[in-house]
């Protein structure tokens, strides 16, 4: 259930932290999986255990393999896995998909990008920064604590860049790297006046008695993010939640959908067991946001079953 | 499947003794510890004690201590919870629940069924 | 021993609704908490673990979060089915102890 994937490079430190959490006054117990061999804690060995953290200084492509953490609670132990993989250098500078952290998205207004791991190490600042290994320079790029801020981001800023720093362990130094995506996104965004895709104003929407029936309420109010925009359904003028009728429930469907680049969302009205009453109500799906309101108005009718009897007659 | 059965509904009368059990089926008895939680009528829930088949290793819960037994027959995978002497505050529900392994621990994962004890004069 | 204090001890909500619980410890429990449901006239069922992982088999409109003292259960969305009595509980330190419980009920 535990089980964590860490990789790094041979001759970089790695260190793996337990994927079960614990005190850090709880003892943690770390083995080599495959022979159950116990790892050392002097911190002369190259590979090392400390507490919750597991320290390949530096890490060999021998060292790859499942290893066990088990943290020792006054109630019960807890155990986890941390699949390990150290690969060779590349010699070229292609960073291949097996070595790279998450992808991050950046835009105009916000451009960090974490460098990934960096908590688990004892580093100095600054970190150096490269993307597509090329050492960046020039004052759009700012180096600030674990993170590198780009000003003013454009589409072109998108690539792989990878952190570089020194971990430092008893007066020793060993090089790490870390490689991660950053992806931009077009933050153009505008609002526009509520505009309904369904349903059509004044429409007839023809149920069966007796049988569950949904309405959607669907409209779009511009492009990205925005700050405000909701959709939600009125029984003669009030509230779902106030109209007080159990049958008749709202649920949100699709959330900021954004197809052609439009923020859409949906709001389902579900009515189970329709009846006869039903078809008195007036049904208002309404759409707001900063601009204003719209409202569309649907009316229920009666859908005649088909009376097989007379197909045949 | 893996699963806990409990022993059947019991009435006794005060000062009298009792013995419930909690067999297990379908997972390895004697790697798992096994617990007792009480459920008073209208009530929550308390924990009263564990036991590790393997080795016999029981802990308490300081307000339990004393006052039950728990012990376990891993031949026939059946835990139990006994009172020499019962009092009609122990009249409730209990259940046996099981607790992780020597070495791992995921919360109480599997439950029986619960058995009902009344005692009353 | 620890005390686990649950809040609300009732809530009534809408299908559809988010539900929210909370569950404060006496003291630092790590992540060392987990989530029971038991429905009227049944056991208790684990749905979450160490704080935040489901069990398998439980839906994913349940959830928790937090560490430390200070942790949460929510229902993204709630269902008929729901409908029951939520303990937080937490195994940090022998006696194991549970919060007084939650009693979820439909509007």
């Known amino acids: 259930k535990f089980s964590k994937q860490s990789w790094g490079l041979e001759n970089e430190a790695l260190i793996v932290r337990c994927p079960r959490q614990g005190k850090p006054s709880y003892t943690v117990d770390w083995y080599y999986s495959q022979t159950n061999k116990s790892i050392p804690t002097q911190e002369r060995n190259r590979v090392f255990a400390s507490g919750q953290l597991l320290k390949f200084l530096p890490a060999a492509v021998a060292d790859s393999g499942i290893y066990t953490c088990i943290v020792r609670s006054p109630t019960f132990n807890r155990t986890g896995y941390a699949n390990v993989t150290i690969y060779k250098k590349q010699s070229d500078c292609n960073v291949p998909d097996y070595l790279m952290y998450s992808t991050v998205s950046g835009s105009e207004k916000n451009s960090k990008i974490y460098c990934p791991t960096i908590d688990l190490y004892n580093w100095t600042a600054p970190l150096e920064w490269f993307k597509n290994c090329q050492a960046l320079q020039g004052s759009r790029y700012r180096a600030h604590k674990s993170f590198l801020v780009i000003d003013n981001v454009m589409t072109e800023d998108a690539g792989d860049y990878t952190c570089k720093f020194i971990h430092n362990e008893n007066g020793a130094n060993y090089s790490v790297t870390a490689t991660r995506s950053f992806t931009v996104k077009d933050e153009q965004g505008f609002s526009l006046f509520p505009v309904i895709g369904a349903p059509a104003q004044n429409e007839i929407k023809e149920v069966e008695i007796g049988k569950n029936a949904n309405l959607t309420c669907s409209a779009c109010f511009g492009k990205g993010t925005q700050f405000l925009a909701a959709v939600l359904w009125q029984l003669n003028g009030t509230k779902i939640t106030d109209f007080g009728e159990p049958r008749i429930q709202q649920e949100e469907g699709q959330n900021q959908s954004f197809s052609n680049g439009l923020a859409c969302l949906d709001m389902v009205l579900r009515i189970a067991d329709v009846k006869e009453e039903d078809l008195l109500l007036q049904y208002d799906c309404l759409a707001l946001n900063l601009h204003g309101l719209r409202r569309h108005t649907v009316r229920l009718s009666r859908k005649n079953p088909i009376d097989h009897h007379s197909i045949y007659c | 499947e893996v699963q806990l059965v409990q022993s059947g509904a019991e009435v006794k009368k005060p000062g009298e003794s009792l013995k419930i059990s909690c067999k297990g089926s379908g997972y390895s008895f004697t790697n798992y510890w096994i617990g007792w939680v009480r459920q008073m009528p209208g009530k929550g829930l308390e924990w009263m004690g564990i036991i590790y088949p393997g080795n016999s290793d029981t802990r308490f819960s300081p307000s339990f201590q004393g006052q039950v037994t728990i012990s376990a027959d891993k031949s026939i995978t059946t835990a139990y919870l006994q009172w020499s002497s019962l009092k009609a505050s122990d009249t409730a529900m209990y259940y046996c629940?099981?607790?992780?392994?020597?070495?791992?621990?995921?919360?109480?994962?599997?439950w029986g069924q619960g058995t009902t004890v009344t005692v009353s004069s | 021993d620890i005390q686990m204090t649950q809040s609300p001890s009732s809530l009534s909500a809408s299908v559809g609704d988010r539900v929210t619980i909370t569950c404060q410890a006496s003291q630092d429990i790590s992540n060392y908490l987990n989530w029971y449901q038991q429905k009227p006239g049944k056991a208790p069922k684990l749905l979450i673990y160490d704080a935040s992982n489901l069990e398998t088999g439980v839906p994913s409109r349940f959830s928790g979060s937090g560490s430390g003292t200070d942790f949460t259960f929510t229902i993204s969305s709630l269902q008929p089915e729901d409908i029951a009595t939520y303990y937080c509980q937490q195994d940090d330190n022998f006696p194991l102890t549970f919060g007084g419980g939650t009693k979820v009920e439909i509007k």
């Open positions: 629940a099981r607790h992780g392994t020597s070495s791992d621990y995921y919360g109480l994962d599997v």
